[in-house]
């Protein structure tokens, strides 16, 4: 009788993660007696993966009954691969043997490859805000993906970015794979409402990519430009002095009124009106009793936006083209949103 | 056909030792292990040990370590079993099996067994 | 080393009658029991191995079942032939134990 072969017919197997592999094994008799194993790896630091003998493998089915005495399909399922079952797997045919079952031949391996899908893409910005004209870097990172092939492509508002530079780790052989991507993109004043998108395809995502994105709003500061403007009211003693702040983003914004240096009024953005591009427009007004005043009056409007020093615009106000109210020696003001008058 | 032939029974003296045979013939002897049980008179079977005849390895029962030798000859798929300092408990029916479980042992071929008597 | 016990030692039955024999052994030895026919005066004979398959040529009236430490051994319908005593035998490990025989006897 011909000696005992141990046949794998299958070179290598691929599967995606979460399924069931199968890994083929006969043998070509039933002699000399003894058990199968599976292992995978060779050499001194195989693992066992399948003892016919004894021990628990829970995730370990076999294709065919092996306690029947005929049987020579050794063929095995293992189940809820994941990439770290990648590798090569050995059907090996022991004979008995005392004190230990002694290995008599192996089957030539099955190369277990495992298709994994890369995580959802993150992606993430600067740790603080940037203002327009300025260059920022946004970083993208999927990871557990197998085989190693994958594309990443930046995105800013549908428009492909070509400032980014991407690598794959390991550079060797591993059972999974990670990508690390990092864009630069210029910032606008019109990128309140930008969004950049990183995509990630891979083979295991049948031409359905995975996104990531990152709104710049999260990212950009847009500074607020400031008009200061003077309009006659009714009242021939009051002027109303106007503090125009467009344009700005985030909201975070505090407004102070000063009279000759002097702090008039503090106030915080609240009834904002928004801008189709997403930034804020906001108005703050101061009405001055001309009358309280001898001496021409430098209004200045200061704007302390998102924690960032302040801006500020000045407005003289002549005083000598109004004449003076007897007896009055203080300024009346009100607040810009309510239009009230304090006396 | 398939069997294991038995050489015939024996009568030996307390001390003596006694070699039985055990020819296989109707399959491929290097493919099995032989195994050893013996059956003394009204009582159970009783392992004695087991042999590769592939490669001659031998496990025997702690009780007769010593005492036994256990040999094949693959030339002419005979096993042997030699038991030696013989005593009025080893009487008994001698019985040589053929062990066919893949990973595990169980004897699914018998020889008609061989007794063997030891009296003075 | 693995111990065997077999129950009951002997039971007494007639043809038609369904017979039951037990086999306990002292460790977990997984599949791996097997179970014989012995008629006086002859080898015994193999009926089932790996607790519940049924040998070559063996009726289909035996069967086995169990695992790990408690074994069945089941004639649904005892035949004139099968008066004979049954023995247990674990192949699990090194040494090889058996039961002490269930002896079946016409009722």
């Known amino acids: 009788e011909e000696e005992l072969q141990v046949i794998q017919p299958d070179k290598s197997v691929l599967v995606a993660a979460g399924e069931t592999a199968t890994l083929r094994c006969t043998a070509t008799s039933l002699i000399p007696v003894g058990p199968i194993q599976w292992f995978r790896g060779a050499g001194p630091g195989r693992e066992l993966i399948y003892n016919q003998k004894e021990g628990h493998f829970p995730r370990v089915t076999t294709v065919s009954e092996l306690t029947k005495r005929e049987n020579m399909d050794f063929s095995i399922r293992i189940g809820n691969i994941t990439p770290a079952d990648a590798g090569t797997y050995y059907c090996v045919k022991f004979r008995k043997g005392s004190p230990d079952d002694v290995e008599f031949k192996s089957g030539a391996g099955t190369e277990l490859s495992v298709r994994a899908k890369p995580s959802a893409p993150v992606v993430s910005g600067p740790a603080a805000r940037a203002t327009p004209q300025h260059t920022v870097s946004f970083t993208c990172e999927s990871h557990g993906f197998s085989p190693r092939d994958i594309t990443l492509k930046w995105f800013k508002n549908g428009n492909e970015l070509s400032d980014f530079q991407t690598n794959v780790d390991p550079v060797g052989e591993s059972v999974s794979y990670s990508i690390h991507s990092t864009a630069k993109v210029v910032l606008t004043r019109e990128d309140v409402h930008s969004q950049v998108i990183c995509e990630v395809a891979h083979v295991t995502l049948q031409g359905d990519p995975l996104r990531g994105t990152a709104n710049l709003s999260e990212t950009i500061r847009v500074p607020p430009t400031l008009e200061v403007t003077q309009q006659p009211v009714r009242a021939e003693n009051q002027v109303n002095v106007t503090c125009q702040v467009r344009k700005f983003y985030p909201q975070r914004l505090q407004l102070t009124w000063l009279e000759n240096g002097n702090v008039s009024r503090t106030e915080t953005a609240s009834t904002v009106t928004e801008n189709k591009d997403g930034t804020y427009n906001w108005m703050s007004w101061l009405l001055v009793n001309v009358s309280a005043h001898r001496d021409d009056v430098k209004l200045t409007c200061q704007v302390e936006h998102d924690g960032q020093p302040a801006v500020s615009k000045s407005h003289d106000l002549k005083v000598s083209a109004h004449p003076k109210e007897q007896g009055s020696n203080t300024a009346a003001e009100n607040t810009g949103s309510n239009e009230r008058n304090i006396y | 056909q398939v069997q294991l032939v038995q050489s015939g029974a024996e009568v030996k003296k307390p001390g003596a030792s006694v070699k039985v045979s055990c020819k296989a013939s109707g399959y491929t002897f290097t493919g099995y292990g032989i195994v050893w049980v013996r059956q003394a008179p009204g009582q159970g079977l009783e392992w004695m040990g087991w042999?590769?005849?592939?490669?001659?390895?031998?496990n025997y029962a702690q009780k007769l370590q010593g005492r036994v030798t256990m040999t094949t000859d693959t030339s002419t798929s005979t096993a042997y079993m030699e038991l030696r300092s013989l005593r009025s408990d080893d009487t008994a029916v001698y019985y040589c099996?053929?062990?066919?479980?893949?990973?595990?042992?169980?004897?699914?071929?018998w020889g008609r067994g061989t007794l063997v008597t030891v009296s003075s | 080393d693995i111990q065997m016990t077999q129950s009951p030692s002997s039971v007494s039955a007639s043809v038609g009658d369904r017979v039951t024999i037990t086999c306990r052994a002292s460790?977990?030895?997984?599949?791996?029991l097997a179970w014989y026919q012995q008629k006086p005066g002859k080898a015994p004979k193999l009926l089932i191995y790996a607790a519940s398959n049924l040998q070559s040529g063996v009726p289909s009236r035996f069967s086995g079942s169990g695992s790990g430490t408690d074994f069945t051994l089941t004639i649904s319908s005892l035949q004139p032939e099968d008066f004979a005593t049954y023995y247990c035998?674990?192949?699990?490990?090194?040494?090889?134990?058996f039961g002490g025989g269930t002896k079946v006897e016409i009722k």
């Open positions: 035998q674990q192949g699990a490990s090194f040494p090889i134990t």
């Open positions: 042999i590769s005849a592939y490669a001659g390895e031998t």
């Open positions: 460790q977990g030895i997984s599949s791996w």
């Open positions: 099996a053929r062990e066919a479980g893949s990973s595990w042992y169980d004897f699914d071929l």
